[in-house]
């Protein structure tokens, strides 16, 4: 981080509580190109050998308010014949994300950062480690 | 969210730019139980039929500054014999996350929200939709 020389209007970096009162512009900047976003397929959830469903998680006191979470459809994976393969497990890939939660009993536009573990999709795993030869 | 009646110290929700100057406490609250966090296996990337690697993406002007990104190891999936299956593709599951980026030419603790598309893991897909029977 480039530490800008402190002025009276900037929080003091040496103060113990400087992280507790930062200013944030919540108008989302779309740094993704629309091409990149539109190329990203949303049908993997049906085409995967470990298909998943998405459930809607909404919390009006959170930013982002709406998060779609994955759940694996089956405990096993789907084989080429469309049957469940009992030697392979369908497992949830989770990611830890940061969300902003409204600080209770404070202004509606005062937030704190919280970690959240969300399911993103599923993958098919064997019970033993195999490497492609 | 309980909308607290506006006081002079709270931004006015009717103002068009109220989202552009919110206060955030960046001291991360770990709302994940240590159990949930410790139960989360990190070996799926090797055991998956669509294995992946993780690379470290660091940006000191971003919060969080370190993000681990997945890349699929192969274009195809690995079958039960450990061989690449040319009928099945290994694809990256991506998630759009929000990060905080330092506002250039501003105080070091003034941020804006940006979208970022990150690879979380890989899954194995067929070129046609199959459903488990």
């Amino acid at each position: 981080a480039v530490l800008i020389p402190q002025s009276s209007v900037c929080p003091n970096a040496e103060a113990n509580n400087f992280l507790q009162n930062v200013k944030v512009n919540l108008k989302v900047i779309n740094s993704l190109s629309s091409k990149a976003s539109s190329r990203r397929p949303s049908d993997y959830l049906n085409r995967s050998t470990s298909p998943w469903t998405l459930s809607r998680n909404e919390d009006p006191d959170r930013y982002p308010s709406v998060i779609w979470e994955a759940q694996c459809r089956h405990q096993r994976c789907v084989n080429a014949e469309g049957k469940l393969d009992h030697h392979m497990n369908s497992v949830l890939i989770q990611q830890e994300i940061l969300v902003l939660k409204r600080e209770p009993e404070k202004c509606p536009f005062t937030f704190r950062v919280e970690k959240m573990l969300v399911g993103v999709g599923c993958t098919c795993v064997s019970s033993i480690v195999r490497h492609a030869s | 969210a309980v909308l607290i009646p506006q006081s002079s110290v709270c931004p006015n929700a009717e103002a068009n730019n109220f989202l552009q100057n919110v206060k955030v406490n960046l001291k991360v609250i770990n709302s994940l139980s240590s159990k949930a966090s410790s139960r989360r296996p990190s070996d799926y990337l090797n055991r998956s039929t669509s294995p992946w690697t993780l690379s470290r993406n660091e940006d000191p002007d971003r919060y969080p500054s370190v993000i681990w990104e997945a890349q699929c190891r192969h274009q195809r999936c690995v079958n039960a014999e450990g061989k690449l299956d040319h009928h099945m593709n290994s694809v990256l599951i991506q998630q759009e996350i929000l990060v905080l980026k330092r506002e250039p030419e501003k105080c070091p603790f003034t941020f804006r929200v940006e979208k970022m598309l990150v690879g979380v893991g890989c899954t194995c897909v067929s070129s046609i939709v199959r459903h488990a029977s």
């Epitope: 919540l26 989302v28 779309n30 629309s34 976003s37 949303s42 049908d43 959830l45 998405l54 459930s55 809607r56 909404e58 009006p60 930013y63 982002p64 308010s65 709406v66 779609w68 509606p108 | 969210a1 309980v2 909308l3 929700a13 989202l19 759009e96 929000l98």
Partner: antibody, heavy 121, light 106 residues
Framework: QVQLQQSGAELVRPGTSVTLSCKAS????????IHWVKQTPVHGLEWIGV????????FYNQKFDGKAELTADKSSSTAYMELRSLTSEDSGVYYC??????????????WGQGTSITVSS | QIVLTQSPAIMSASPGEKVTMTCSAS?????IYWFQQKPGTSPKRWIY???ELASGVPARFSGSGSGTSYSLTISSMEAEDAATYYC?????????FGGGSKLEIK
Amino acid sequence: QVQLQQSGAELVRPGTSVTLSCKASGYIFTDYEIHWVKQTPVHGLEWIGVNDPESGGTFYNQKFDGKAELTADKSSSTAYMELRSLTSEDSGVYYCTRYYRYESFYGMDYWGQGTSITVSS
Amino acid sequence: QIVLTQSPAIMSASPGEKVTMTCSASSSISYIYWFQQKPGTSPKRWIYATFELASGVPARFSGSGSGTSYSLTISSMEAEDAATYYCHQRSSYPWTFGGGSKLEIK
């Protein structure tokens, strides 16, 4: 400016299916969910369900589960609703409306002009 | 599901008159939303998150309430306010709408 342009009125036969479209412009399509609402003189406004163009996620009012299928095409910024096994009960005006994913405080802020569906033999 | 009951179903008011319509929820909800609809047009977001006026809505409109009881008030009725007003909740699935309050000008 923000616009949700819906497809034209349809007169359809009972037992058939119909697909309605909702083309979005003037905003980033994937920042908003698309919700669908039905309006009839008898039942008033009824929420059908939601599609998230970003993830492909869908969630339905149980009443319309199996009746409606919601999809979206990110490349053309268009949302679709397919209505199946149509009966006279499905006649009505169908609206698409957008909902900001990041801050739900705003609710459903812009609506399409509506598509009238008449099911008759 | 949460049932929203609007009253009165139909009302008429003279220009300059104060108008209040209510929306009663069968269970407690966190926010109410109000939509205005005129014949042959789509609903317009009118009041969001119980209190906030949508862009372009005249200041004579206001929203209030909490829990199960909410209201929309017009401080001084004008001809252009004649329309049907619907309340809406999204605190619980399925999201629901009230049956509407039709406001006519005398």
